[in-house]
Amino acid sequence: MMTGTIETTGNISAEKGGSIILQCHLSSTTAQVTQVNWEQQDQLLAICNADLGWHISPSFKDRVAPGPGLGLTLQSLTVNDTGEYFCIYHTYPDGTYTGRIFLEVLESSVAEHGARFQIPHHHHHH
């Protein structure tokens, strides 16, 4: 039975040209995290493999930095970066846990971080 939950930074906003940290945290499970994948809609941004470390997609290397921790830092933000981001935790023996973050990139300086909140996680077994 999968008991884990993912807490994320939730709905967040940031200024065009700035940076933002995407963070997820998996709790309430003793499952071993084997890999965390970060995805934006239908594109893989980065992988953090427990054995092999961080690997950033070649097409995002200039704008994506690993960390802090298992999080991901997006740099030089554009309005096109607005959208859904997913942290996908591959675990053993539980399977896969997925967290969702919505990022809005704003033209002006009205950007604020949304409060941290826990989202319902969806998951599937391998």
Epitope: Q35, N37, L44, D51, L52, G53, H55, S57, H126
Partner: antibody, heavy 117, light 107 residues
Amino acid sequence: EVQLVQSGAEVKKPGASVKVSCKASGYAFTNYLIEWVRQAPGQRLEWMGVINPGSGGTNYKEKFKGRVTITADKSSSTAYMELSSLRSEDTAVYYCARGEYFFFDYWGQGTTVTVSS
Amino acid sequence: DIVMTQSPDSLAVSLGERATINCKASQHVSNGVAWYQHKPGQSPKLLIYSASYRYTGVPDRFSGSGSGTDFTLTISSLQAEDVAVYYCQQHYNTPHTFGGGTKVEIK
């Protein structure tokens, strides 16, 4: 020019071990993964495992765990794949490849390993 | 493990015609798919990574598309030197599994 040069063909008896080397040149050895892939006659390519030469971290396909050991010597920019308890089904061409974000952009020339009594 | 199923197993296409190879992943792999060309007696060569990014030096007649579970490699105008076996591979999660291969021949 990036190059991966593998050791020569081997003929082994069942139960023996084989160690294949892969010497890298033309790039920073510790900045990329080294992956090992094999192809048995008439079969698809099969991923065996990978090493991060910078950290020494490894990851193996479950079916090879306990039988395969992948190592890397930073001083000579050489990776090694040792497969033990050989059986006839291990007869294959073994390739090393440079891993960039878990796809393989440069490949060695392949090493034929024949297991026969 | 993620299973990559390629179709068709073999394909005969006239010179200058289009060749299309499909690959289906048993579960979501985002755009984490690469395509390789493998000729007899040679090492495989990377053609496409991250589903649609053409690798350096690869002719633009090769293109890739897809995301999630369904992926396609297209050779827009088949040349004699394209006769080979083509493999898809998922680079989304370990173990990095390959498809069964598609043999492309001249009709």
